[in-house]
């Protein structure tokens, strides 16, 4: 059932067993979600496993803008600027919670969703499989 | 303001720009733990900027456990296993959304919160400041 606030200190729910629909307060302490990570640091450019940041925009999601990292090279950049293919640039992934509008276009009705995002890249030694 | 459902198909909101309090359906899309990729890679060990994962635990937050990456070295690990201090291991940070009960112990009222977490580390060329 839809959660409708009553007189008590807690919002009440029509569903006595479990509130599948809850109230979420979006007064986030730090609400400026679409901050471009390029501004916070230039690691994406200075890394030995540099990455490009792709803007993933979805007006039906909160936050509507998520930045996805895509490694620039298969290998890693050496001091001379050349790429060393004996090493691998790999994305570091993180699972995050987002809100998705549901039904679509409803301004204040959402569904909680977990998504996997690539945050940046790191340079790793490859796993070498020896064939007998 | 509190979002109260009206007669239309969508719950209404007092804030026309962006609702402060929204309805959230908790039937999460990616519910099964088995589909939760817990970063099942050993990049943290194989990286040239390896990191340790530290537990950040808060029982009043979901997720209750978040893993924070702490770079093992100031420098980066070379092919011979030694640390190169002419390069820097730096944390890659990501802002994530978490849910907090508010008021505490109310079963169907939550507050969305943003926290900054270190997801992993990358190896970067240092910024050299030349003194005149």
């Amino acid at each position: 059932g839809i959660a409708i606030p009553r007189n008590s200190g807690c919002p009440n729910s029509e569903d006595k067993n479990f509130p599948r629909t809850v109230m979420v307060n979006l007064n986030i302490h730090n609400r400026n979600t679409s901050t471009n990570p390029k501004r916070s640091s230039d690691y994406y450019n200075r890394s030995t496993s540099p990455w490009n940041l792709h803007r993933n925009e979805d007006p039906e999601r909160y936050p509507s803008v998520i930045w996805e990292a895509k490694c620039r090279h298969l290998g890693c950049v050496k001091a001379d600027g050349n790429v060393d293919y004996h090493m691998n640039s790999v994305p570091i992934q993180q699972e995050i919670l987002v809100l998705r509008r549901e039904p679509r276009h409803c301004p204040n009705s959402f569904r909680l969703e977990k998504i996997l995002v690539s945050v940046g890249c790191t340079c790793v030694t490859p796993i070498v499989h020896h064939v007998a | 303001g509190i979002a109260i459902p009206r007669n239309s198909g969508c719950p209404n909101s007092e804030d026309k720009n962006f609702p402060r309090t929204v309805m959230v359906n908790l039937n999460i899309h990616n519910r099964n733990t088995s589909t939760n990729p817990k970063r099942s890679s050993d990049y943290y060990n194989r990286s040239t900027s390896p990191w340790n994962l530290h537990r950040n635990e808060d029982p009043e937050r979901y997720p209750s456990v978040i893993w924070e990456a702490k770079c093992r070295h100031l420098g980066c690990v070379k092919a011979d296993g030694n640390v190169d201090y002419h390069m820097n291991s730096v944390p890659i940070q990501q802002e994530i959304l978490v849910l907090r009960r508010e008021p505490r112990h109310c079963p169907n009222s939550f507050r969305l919160e943003k926290i900054l977490v270190s997801v992993g580390c990358t190896c970067v060329t240092p910024i050299v400041h030349h003194v005149a």
């Epitope: - | 999460i28 817990k38 970063r39 099942s40 060990n45 994962l53 029982p59 937050r61």
Partner: antibody
């Protein structure tokens, strides 16, 4: 200090159901999951499924899908595990455990369920 | 399901001995590996989480190592209260446990 206290031993007939309870004392469930793990006599540990009481999200091991139901009552800080269509091989000690979704850090004392005709 | 294989299935040791138990995952699980101790008639107790982190209140003689598919639990100097069964458990996927290793008195 979190303590999980489980209901007492049960003797059940094949084909019947059993419902085991797990009460969190010394605090609420908080945002953790509660998992159920069983151990047949002289055997190892087997995860059955979990619930996050805050949200009511459940996740069941494939083996028990359709036969196990995990619920939670936040007002009493109690989780329940119901297993239906019992057979003799379901004779085991059933444990509830607080589950961070990474490890089980607090366990109930266990409930012995015996299935016998 | 990810299969967890422990070895040995049992080990006889004396007080003061160094005991090593290994656990192998059927696929890479990063560091999402935990170790539990269980005594007869009791519930399991978490010793090590995330492959190498010591759970609070657990003596420092217990240590864990490994990453990917191969993991080790080491008891540096066996104490009388350490005679028990030890289980590894992965949580990279739906949780699965190893079959257990019984540490017995020699």
């Amino acid at each position: 200090q979190v303590q999980l206290v489980q209901s007492g031993a049960e003797v059940k007939k094949p084909g019947s159901s059993v419902k085991v309870s797990c009460k969190a004392s010394g605090g609420t469930f908080s945002s953790y999951a509660i998992s159920w793990v069983r151990q047949a006599p002289g055997q190892g540990l087997e995860w059955m499924g979990s619930i996050i009481p805050w949200f009511g999200w459940t996740n069941y091991a494939q083996k028990f899908q359709g036969r196990v139901t995990i619920t939670a009552d936040e007002s009493t800080s109690t989780a329940y595990m119901e297993l239906s269509s019992l057979r003799s091989e379901d004779t085991a000690v059933y444990y509830c455990a607080r589950d961070s979704e990474y490890y089980f850090d607090h366990w109930g004392q266990g409930t012995l369920v015996t299935v016998s005709s | 399901d990810i299969q967890m294989t422990q070895s040995p299935s049992s080990v006889s040791a004396s007080v003061g001995d160094r005991v090593t138990i290994t656990c192998r995952a059927s696929q890479g699980i990063s560091n999402w590996l935990n170790w539990y101790q269980q005594k007869p008639g009791k519930a399991p107790k978490l010793l090590i989480y995330a492959a190498s982190s010591l759970q609070s209140g657990v003596p420092s003689r217990f240590s864990g190592s490994g990453s990917g598919t191969d993991f080790t639990l080491t008891i540096s100097s066996l104490q009388p209260e350490d005679f028990a069964t030890y289980y590894c458990q992965q949580y990279s996927d739906d949780p699965t446990f190893g079959q257990g290793t019984k540490v017995e008195i020699k």
